[in-house]
């Protein structure tokens, strides 16, 4: 019994004065608590608690369930305890079958013994199965068996408490261990779409998916830079043991322009937090913005191909697209397609494929697109570079030799004279007059240049070359002439000088 200094309150004394008492089933339990300030007896076993205000606790016929801790408390709050085992060969274990363990923590299998003198108090797997190799436990006859550092892999583990009695193994009822996972990573959050574009009055609905090991993950939708509570609805599922999914759906039934902004889905657990955002843009009406992918002024060589390419943003979806040239609509040679297959895509591409362009096919090519709200257009000015063509080469009545050439860009005309005795010439002749003529064709067509030289300067038989050239190519025409006496014979133009 405890001894204390005089004047200090002392704990009560219990008879019999032992810490543990063993009685047989059916025998009497008689416990006396002696204390001037006696208050009560308390009995505890598993989750059961009983009280008695008599200073003597008497149980006439003890049962196994009377096994437990009996505590006497005085008015000073001081107490003394005795543990009573009621030995019942038919009931070796008291059992509370609920068994939950938090991952990485210890958990108690509550199977206290009614007989402390049995041996080999331990845990066994159900149906003879071995326990996990790394499972460690500490038996305590008064409390049960403590499993150390519960692992996630122990979830749904079936086990029994076990003792040896008279050389035989006796098992308790079975326990199923339910492991509550520890958070070892932040929640995984994702959003149904990263951005939303709506017109005023349309419904905005966005779903955030939160995945974690258990349902105790916290989640919420927040508006960035705002404390306003948002209305959200939840659905949740357990996909297997440690795979929990929650869907939090945020809805604004009739979106307004000032609802535009960034919305954040936030989730946290004891490990940390994660978030994902979606952007809402609400516009008062639809739009189309066109971006040319090549310069809108295009130069292409005669006979070559060119692709006129535009990208455009259209919201809502484009309904009509067309390419037009000289008031005629192309029925083929073009394609229009979305820039990406993403469902929130608003960017599109349109390509007009012009093949083997002729000099006459320069001009303005226009792309038009419309949706339910707006129309838009962009024009390309296409210039076809053409090799010069010599349209006329004549001797005029005033004695001038004239060469007229057409091409794009504007041709330059050079003149050369070769006396008849020369087999190769190097002498160039300066023109008397050079004019750019207005073409009667459409704009963007060929440019016409006229150049003249004075044939009276030539004193010998010979050949004159008119050469027209630009960046695309060159063309030559030739004049042969001869003197008869003092008169020049009629000049004969010809285009080819064959070696």
């Amino acid at each position: 019994q405890p001894s204390v200094s005089p004047g200090e309150p002392s704990p009560p004394s219990i008879h019999p004065g032992k810490s543990d008492l063993i009685v047989r089933v059916g025998d009497e339990i008689r416990l006396l608590c002696t204390d001037p300030g006696f208050v009560k007896w308390t009995f505890e076993i598993l989750d059961e608690t009983n009280e008695n205000k008599q200073n003597e606790w008497i149980t006439e016929k003890a049962e196994a369930t009377n096994t437990g801790k009996y505590t006497c408390t005085n008015k000073h709050g001081l107490s003394n305890s005795i543990y009573v085992f009621v030995r019942d060969p038919a009931k070796l274990f008291l059992v509370d079958r609920s068994l939950y363990g938090k991952e990485d923590n210890d958990t108690l299998v509550r199977c206290p013994l009614t007989d402390p003198e049995v041996t080999n108090y331990s845990l066994k797997g159900c149906q003879g199965k071995p326990l996990p190799k790394d499972l460690r436990f500490i038996p305590d006859p008064k409390a049960g068996i403590m499993i150390k550092s519960v692992k996630r892999a122990y979830h749904r583990l079936c086990l029994h408490c076990s003792v040896d009695q008279e050389g035989k193994s006796v098992l308790s009822e079975k326990f199923i261990l339910k492991v509550r996972p520890a958070f070892k990573a932040v929640p995984v959050v994702s959003v149904s779409k990263a951005s939303y574009l709506l017109r005023e009055g349309e419904e905005f609905t966005v779903t955030c998916t939160i995945k974690d090991v258990s349902s105790s993950v916290y989640s919420t939708w927040k508006r960035e830079n705002s404390q306003t509570k948002l209305q959200e609805k939840y659905n949740s599922w357990h996909h297997g043991d440690f795979n929990y999914e929650r869907q939090a759906t945020l809805t604004i039934s009739s979106a307004r322009v000032n609802d535009s902004g960034v919305f954040m889905c936030y989730a946290n657990n004891t490990f940390g937090s994660a978030n994902v955002t979606t952007t809402l843009e609400v516009v008062d009406k639809g739009f189309i913005n066109i971006f040319p992918m090549i310069n809108t002024t295009v130069f292409v060589n005669d006979g070559e191909n060119v692709d006129l390419i535009v990208e455009y943003e259209a919201f809502p979806k484009p309904e009509h697209q067309q390419w037009i040239y000289m008031n005629r609509t192309f029925t083929d040679k073009w394609e229009d397609y979305p820039k990406s297959e993403n469902e929130s895509n608003i960017r599109y591409v349109s390509e007009l494929h012009l093949t083997r362009l002729k000099g006459t096919e320069g001009g303005t090519y226009t792309f038009l697109v419309s949706n339910s709200d707006v129309n838009a257009a962009i024009a390309f000015n296409v210039y076809v570079n053409t090799k010069p063509e010599i349209l006329t080469y004549d001797r005029l009545v005033n004695g001038m030799l004239q060469c007229v050439a057409a091409g794009f860009p504007e041709p330059t005309i050079d003149w050369y004279f070769c006396p008849g005795t020369e087999q190769r010439c190097s002498a160039s002749v300066l023109p008397v007059d050079v004019q750019t003529l207005n073409s009667s064709g459409p704009p963007f067509g060929k440019l016409v240049v006229q150049s003249s030289i004075d044939s009276s300067a030539f004193k010998h038989n010979g050949t004159v070359e008119c050469k027209a050239y630009n960046d695309v190519g060159k063309t030559s025409a030739y004049f042969n002439f001869a003197f008869k006496g003092n008169n020049k014979e009629q000049i004969h133009p010809h285009t080819l000088f064959t070696p």
Epitope: Y416, Q423, R424, S426, P499
Partner: antibody, heavy 121, light 108 residues
Framework: QIQLVQSGPELRKPGESVKISCKAS????????MYWVKQAPGKGLKWMGW????????TYADDFKGRFVFSLEASANTANLQISNLKNEDTATYFC??????????????WGQGTSVTVSS | SYELIQPPSASVTLGNTVSLTCVGD??????AQWYQQKPDKTIVSVIY???ERPSGISDRFSGSSSGTTATLTIHGTLAEDEADYYC???????????FGGGTKLTVL
Amino acid sequence: QIQLVQSGPELRKPGESVKISCKASGYTFTDYAMYWVKQAPGKGLKWMGWINTYTGKPTYADDFKGRFVFSLEASANTANLQISNLKNEDTATYFCARARGLVDDYVMDAWGQGTSVTVSS
Amino acid sequence: SYELIQPPSASVTLGNTVSLTCVGDELSKRYAQWYQQKPDKTIVSVIYKDSERPSGISDRFSGSSSGTTATLTIHGTLAEDEADYYCLSTYSDDNLPVFGGGTKLTVL
């Protein structure tokens, strides 16, 4: 058929002279100019100049003025190239080619087989 | 001095098409010519006046000129097309001819 046949290979010492011939057949000799082209070993073609086969007037590229002479033996339908005071850098194959045209629209449409000249001491 | 620039070498697989280029400042207003020199040193004209073919030259050979670049294209290349190819044009007021450095074509 049109043919330009050149004289055979020549071996000379520095300071000596050499004369290469180019005999034309199969066309009217005086209707076409005769061009001369040099090709040093392992190098590209280099235009040397030309001779008017009708007037006999030669024209030389800048690098071939002085020691080089183009001449004709019109009666024999032959053009000649003479190089005097030979130098090591004259070692090359020399080609003759006929051409007709005005300024830059001519074409050298027939070529000799080339004459190899080696200058070595 | 005036130069016509040609790539030193080019290769083509038998039967394929190859394009050889020649770049010179005056080519926008001067005609280009192309000459083929076989390994035995034989020289023939294959193109003159940018795109004209002398008689007897296969139509597999074609020429073009745009701006300051002249191009010789050989379609359906044969083993016998393996050769050095030289472009030629004129320059200066005297219209002096000049050759490019040549391109060695290898047929694989």
